[in-house]
Amino acid sequence: LIIGFGISGRHSITVTTVASAGNIGEDGILSCTFEPDIKLSDIVIQWLKEGVLGLVHEFKEGKDELSEQDEMFRGRTAVFADQVIVGNASLRLKNVQLTDAGTYKCYIITSKGKGNANLEYKTGAFSMPEVNVDYNASSETLRCEAPRWFPQPTVVWASQVDQGANFSEVSNTSFELNSENVTMKVVSVLYNVTINNTYSCMIENDIAKATGDIKVTESEIKRRSHLQLLNSKAS
């Protein structure tokens, strides 16, 4: 969490941002909140990006003002206009690109004064893994697949029964470049699995960590997966 304050002159207002990550090809949110004002027409929101000449986005007098927007963001940004009055200056970024990563500034002017806060925005690809029993294999084998990751992640297997065991010798992981030549499909195979055990396939890069669990018993198979973004710090 980053909390920024206005500098000298008039009064300062508190602006708060949260570091976040964007999944390339999808839409992302850059979070920013501020002390609200009574009149929408008195609020100006400007989003800036380090190393970029033009603005990322500007909202003033109750509407978008995009005449000074940098071309790399043209047609890709929006604020939540109906939430500005309650202090939400978050930016929606469409079709996140790898090059959108960097330091952004949420800069706010209201009748009370001005304030700003920076946020770090990481970009990459991350997806939920799915773990299945591979019935085609000659021995009891699990197959963990996740369709889109970037940068290349690490894959670690774990088991509830053999806690702390190292499965690197009995697993094999491959990365296959997807058609857009950036993201990769992750496939990891675990051999010699035993029944009545829960196995976890953990995929992690510097942006996200995802886990796919599978519990195999004689009567059923249970699956569960979850994904967590890393380094979500507020400012």
Epitope: S8, L48, E68, T103, K105, I109, N118
Partner: antibody, heavy 123, light 112 residues
Framework: EIQLQQSGPELVMPGASVKVSCTAS????????MYWVKQSHGKSLEWIAY????????SYNQKFKGKATLTVDKSSSTAYMHLNSLTSEDSAVYYC????????????????WGAGTTVTVSS | DVVMTQTPLSLPVSLGDQASISCRSS???????????LHWYLQKPGQSPKLLIY???NRFSGVPDRFSGSGSGTDFTLKISRVEAEDLGVYFC?????????FGAGTKLELK
């Protein structure tokens, strides 16, 4: 297009003063600090001062305190630098430059520069 | 004031050569917040300076990838992998970690 348009060359007498202007276009004038930089003939660059156009707040290089005075006119998106008690040492090209993105006060790099105003002090 | 020392002051090159310019500061440029505020500019003859690299190694938008910056503490380097005609001019390093902001004397990149 983002531009900083500076006023034309000045030939002034020793002891006189001069006011150099810098008009910004293509970006929100009050969002970025405006800096002034001196370049003496064939020499390096010296930072003079900056002004925050939002509130008129200034910060000066100690060396130029009493020599330069910065002001802005928000309505015309124009920054001014007034130089007084001019001597031959003040003959130089003076640039206005927009601050790049800043994290606090420190990332004082300049991403847009004016073309420069030549000030010649001579009798 | 922090003194910025650039070497060499003049660098004769042929087009296509790699060029390397050094910049040394009289004190560390690592700010207490962790960032290092060392920047590079190019001033072509008769023009104002233009920003190339900010905060040691970040290329400014539109700057070709043949330009790269590196270094830490007090020692910094600007490299041009293959010099083109449009790269000729005077290169300045600048620090903004300490007030007042200061510039190096400049390195003139010229044809042999």
């Amino acid at each position: 297009e983002i531009q900083l348009q500076q006023s034309g060359p000045e030939l002034v007498m020793p002891g006189a003063s001069v006011k150099v202007s810098c008009t910004a276009s293509g970006y929100p004038f009050t969002t970025y600090n405006m800096y002034w930089v001196k370049q003496s003939h064939g020499k390096s660059l010296e930072w003079i001062a900056y002004i925050d156009p939002y509130n008129g707040g200034t910060s000066y290089n100690q060396k130029f305190k009493g020599k330069a005075t910065l002001t802005v006119d928000k309505s015309s998106s124009t920054a001014y630098m007034h130089l007084n008690s001019l001597t031959s040492e003040d003959s130089a090209v003076y640039y206005c430059a927009r601050s790049g993105f800043y994290d606090g006060y420190y990332a004082w790099y300049f991403d847009v520069w004016g073309a420069g105003t030549t000030v010649t002090v001579s009798s | 004031d922090v003194v910025m020392t650039q070497t060499p002051l003049s660098l004769p090159v042929s087009l296509g050569d790699q060029a390397s310019i050094s910049c040394r500061s009289s004190q560390s440029l690592v700010h207490s917040g962790g960032n290092t505020y060392l920047h590079w500019y190019l001033q072509k003859p008769g023009q104002s300076p233009k920003l190339l690299i900010y905060k040691v190694s970040n290329r400014f938008s539109g700057v070709p990838d043949r330009f790269s910056g590196s270094g830490s503490g007090t020692d910094f380097t600007l490299k041009i992998s293959r010099v083109e005609a449009e790269d000729l001019g005077v290169y300045f390093c600048s620090q903004s970690t300490h007030v007042p902001l200061t510039f190096g004397a400049g390195t003139k990149l010229e044809l042999k």
